[in-house]
């Protein structure tokens, strides 16, 4: 997290706020609930109380405005900037401007005025932007789901930096980001992208180039916000330039950030048992054509050029790749050897003489 | 219904730059996933260069540090700066919207020569 120069924050703990205006994009109910829940998300982990006025001079002012709107920080039209807000202070201080010239909804459609309010807050309270790819905080707008809204630590940690925690949180898990070089990290998912490799776990993934050591960190929903937050296995088929990702029962076949029509499926349409509840790890191999599925302690082998699943199968991990153990988090192939994660520990298995040869740390792939 | 089309392809010698566009008529193309294609002759068109809705990049490895995407969602547009060109970059260049299944351009002729 990061506050600003000569931490600006407010003196007193009650704060009040006004509505001056509305959006055509919204119900006026709509747009004083998103507010009213947006404040929520900051009184809930600090002593700060917010209060409603409808006329008169409130702490913190909202409005709406496109282009030259009154402070001499213009906005550009449709998307681009889609709103800012003061740091602490009087007049201006504290004040939220929403650039009408964007679809504010309630929905993902759009832009979600709630994320945005609630990101704006943040600096109306004092807290500037943060570098941390998975805080409200962060200057990049993701759509972060439907499922209830959960504070991030970080932007939790910044906060109470300022004004301290609150009395009781009511939502006390805020979710952290992975630290790479945690050395009990275990991984969701990993598959090769167009050359680079993609290593997802929990609602994130590293994105790792061959050419460099430092991966970067992005949520999985700023490159695919139509995907699940998180995901349980995916492969690559680079012949065809199309990854699988897997969640659950379902999959979806995606063109670099696009979702191929007819997608999510069921993944009994690759002609697994209904009983298969989730795909845990895949692999795809592009010499011969198969991918490997692995669920539990089995996997199946699908041909991807027939669209059948293999005779003989599923097997036992165990059987097939013996010493990895009863279960694969994350798979990926290289150079004749596949890397199996289990836990926080990877094998190097070499296709050739069909043995591990290397038993490593799973976070070595991020060169830690 | 997006339409493409793309300009500013040309012969440049190895080291030059160019700078493709790729102009949209229709609504949605804010709404979709601006890419880069090429295809060389002989070869299977390959991918170069995409940007999402929320502006992420992304590149094939051969370009990457070379070439740069952006785009301007207010005017149409989308944008493709090469630097650095080898001649194994000669090849017709493809404006895309939307990816595989979406809206493609006639293509731009870039020839780099050494």
């Known amino acids: 997290y990061n506050v600003f120069p000569r931490t600006l924050k407010w003196s007193k703990m009650n704060l009040t706020y006004r509505i001056v205006n509305y959006t055509p994009d919204m119900t006026h109910s709509e747009v004083e609930k998103a507010f009213k829940k947006a404040f929520k998300v900051w009184s809930d982990v600090t002593p700060l109380n917010f209060t409603r006025l409808h006329d008169g001079i409130a702490d913190i002012m909202i409005s709406f405005g496109i282009k030259e709107h009154g402070d001499f920080y213009p906005f550009d039209g449709p998307s681009g900037l889609l709103a800012h807000a003061f740091p602490p202070g009087p007049n201006y201080g504290g004040d939220a401007h929403f650039d009408d010239d964007e679809t504010w909804t309630s929905s993902s459609k759009g832009y979600n005025l709630f994320l945005v309010a609630a990101h704006e807050f943040g600096h109306s309270l004092g807290l500037d932007h943060s570098k941390d790819p998975g805080a409200l905080m962060f200057p990049i707008y993701t759509y972060t789901g439907k499922s209830h809204f959960m504070l991030p630590d970080d932007d939790v940690q910044g906060i109470q930096s300022l004004y301290g925690p609150g009395d009781e949180d009511p939502n006390p898990k805020h979710p952290k980001t992975p630290d790479k070089c945690d050395p009990s990290l275990s991984l969701d998912a990993i598959t090769s992208l167009r050359g680079e490799t993609m290593i997802f776990k929990d609602r994130f993934f590293w994105r790792l180039h061959p050419q460099q050591v430092d991966a970067e960190l992005f949520l999985t929903k700023s490159f695919w916000p139509e995907l699940p937050n998180r995901i349980d296995a995916a492969y690559e088929h680079p012949s065809h330039d199309l990854i699988f990702i897997f969640r659950g029962r379902k999959f979806w076949a995606l063109n670099g950030y696009d979702i191929l029509e007819g997608y999510p499926k069921k993944i009994s349409e690759l002609g697994l048992p209904k009983e298969v509840k989730k795909i845990s790890a895949a692999v795809h191999f592009e010499d011969t054509g198969k991918t490997l599925l692995f669920s539990g302690n089995q996997v199946w082998r699908y041909d991807d050029t027939n669209h059948i699943m293999d005779k003989d199968y599923p097997r036992l991990i165990e059987e097939d790749f013996p010493g990895i153990g009863d279960k694969v988090d994350a798979v990926y192939e290289k150079n004749g050897y596949i890397y199996f994660f289990n836990g926080p520990i990877q094998f190097e298995y070499s296709i050739w003489s069909n043995r591990i040869v290397r038993v490593m740390p799973a976070n070595s792939i991020l060169w830690c | 219904k997006v339409q493409l089309v793309e300009s500013g392809g040309g012969s440049v010698q190895a080291g030059g730059s160019l700078r493709l566009s790729c102009a949209a008529s229709?609504?949605?193309?804010?709404?979709?996933?601006m890419n880069w294609y090429r295809q060389a002759p002989g070869k299977q068109r390959e991918f170069v260069a995409g940007i999402s809705t929320g502006r992420i990049t992304n590149y094939a490895v051969s370009v990457k540090g070379r070439f740069t995407i952006s785009r301007d969602n207010a005017e149409g547009t989308g944008y493709l700066q090469m630097n650095s060109l080898k001649p194994e970059d000669t090849a017709v260049y493809y404006c895309n919207a939307g990816g595989l299944q979406g809206y493609w351009g006639l293509g731009t002729q870039v020839t780099v020569s050494s």
């Open positions: 229709g609504s949605t193309f804010s709404r979709r996933s």
